[in-house]
């Protein structure tokens, strides 16, 4: 899996989107977890509704929300009131039994103030070998990194 960077601004909300094959993951609940250490487990932050048919309902855990468009195949995580401590490595997961498949590996990056980072778009403009994807959230940017650019620890 590549690691995708989502960049947000402290005090604002950040939306992270995780696309997936809706047929392959039909009937599966989803989850958002945070990598705890270099080789540590991925700790569950929030998961979709216990009833898969109600996955479209937004579920909150603290300042983090999750909602799943099961037909369109997009899992959306909202981090409200983003702060420096939210920065780090996360995963979108598809759950089946006690197992979890990784849908996307994510690096959340938190900036101090949008006016202080007017050049962020220039800094993050991708090269030809990279895909760029707008996160469609004010002051947020996402960018896929090439495999190997960021070593992501294995999940347990």
């Amino acid at each position: 899996h590549n690691t995708t960077v989502f960049q947000g601004v402290a005090g604002q909300s950040l939306q992270v989107s995780c696309p997936y094959d809706s047929m392959k993951h039909w009937g599966r609940r989803k989850a958002w977890c945070r990598q705890l250490g270099e080789k540590g487990p991925c700790q569950r932050v929030v998961s979709t509704h216990n009833l898969w048919l109600l996955s479209f309902l937004r579920r909150w855990n603290g300042s983090t929300a999750i909602t799943d468009d099961t037909l369109g195949g997009t899992l959306t995580i909202t981090l409200r009131n983003l702060q420096p401590h939210d920065a780090g490595l996360y995963q979108c997961q598809s759950l089946h039994g006690s197992e979890a498949d990784t849908l996307r590996k994510v690096l959340v990056e938190v900036l101090a103030d949008p006016l202080d980072h007017r050049d962020a778009g220039d800094l993050w403009f991708p090269g030809e070998s990279e895909s760029f994807e707008d996160a469609h959230v004010e002051h947020s940017i996402s960018r896929s990194l090439l495999e190997g650019e960021i070593p992501f620890p294995p999940t347990s």
Partner: antibody
């Protein structure tokens, strides 16, 4: 093992600029943030900002905005911190410190420090 | 800006004694607090993160506790190499800030 080796001491005049380097080894340079923290003589620690070596993206403490520039050269696994318009109260030891990606705002490894003296 | 106040400024103890260092935040930082040790002429070293998690290679005699605004670093039995200055750091909000430090000196 992780090592951060910084450039040597500098003496600068007020109004000048200084550029401190920090060479990383023992880990994937683009796989962690690099922070810069300074410590005035006999004083506490003051965070200046960070750079993501993978993207070059930066985030500076408001106090240093407009005076500090953090850059990197991934080909030689080296981060740089340049501070301009130096004043006497910029005299300090400047440290680079690694922020691991899983917890980017803690500083798990530090350079040995670079003393920058600003004096006329 | 979150202000971290450390107390006492200096702690005079003997090897083998228990050291209790305090760090108080001007507003809640939840559990987003780290502790560092700094010896003269050296760079700081990470001891504790997330208020209570020991960093890699840190001896079990170091422990951290607290949440919200009040935090404690405890050294259960001081070793000769533990006499140093200790700083707390919050990573809850920008700018990241440090406390003024507590010096643990030999009595």
């Amino acid at each position: 093992q992780v090592q951060l080796v910084q450039s040597g001491a500098e003496v600068k005049k007020p109004g000048a600029s200084v550029k401190v380097s920090c060479k990383a080894s023992g880990y994937t340079f683009t796989g962690s943030y690099m922070h810069w923290v300074r410590q005035a003589p006999g004083q506490g620690l003051e965070w200046m900002g960070w750079i993501n070596p993978n993207s070059g993206g930066t985030n500076y403490a408001q106090k240093f905005q407009g005076r500090v520039t953090m850059t990197r050269d991934t080909s030689i696994s080296t981060a740089y911190m340049e501070l301009s318009r130096l004043r006497s109260d910029d005299t300090a030891v400047y440290y680079c410190a690694r922020g691991p990606l899983y917890h980017p705002m803690i500083f798990d490894y530090w350079g040995q420090g670079t003393l920058v003296t600003v004096s006329s | 800006e979150i202000v971290l106040t450390q107390s006492p400024a200096t702690l005079s103890l003997s090897p083998g004694e228990r050291a209790t260092l305090s760090c108080r935040a001007s507003q809640s930082v939840s559990s987003y607090l780290a502790w560092y040790q700094q010896k003269p002429g050296q760079a700081p070293r990470l001891l504790i993160y997330d208020a209570s998690n020991r960093a890699t290679g840190i001896p079990a005699r170091f422990s951290g506790s607290g949440s919200g605004t009040d935090f404690t670093l405890t050294i259960s039995s001081l070793e000769p190499e533990d006499f140093a200055v200790y700083y707390c750091q919050q990573l809850s909000t920008y700018p990241l800030t440090f406390g003024g430090g507590t010096k643990v000196e030999i009595k």
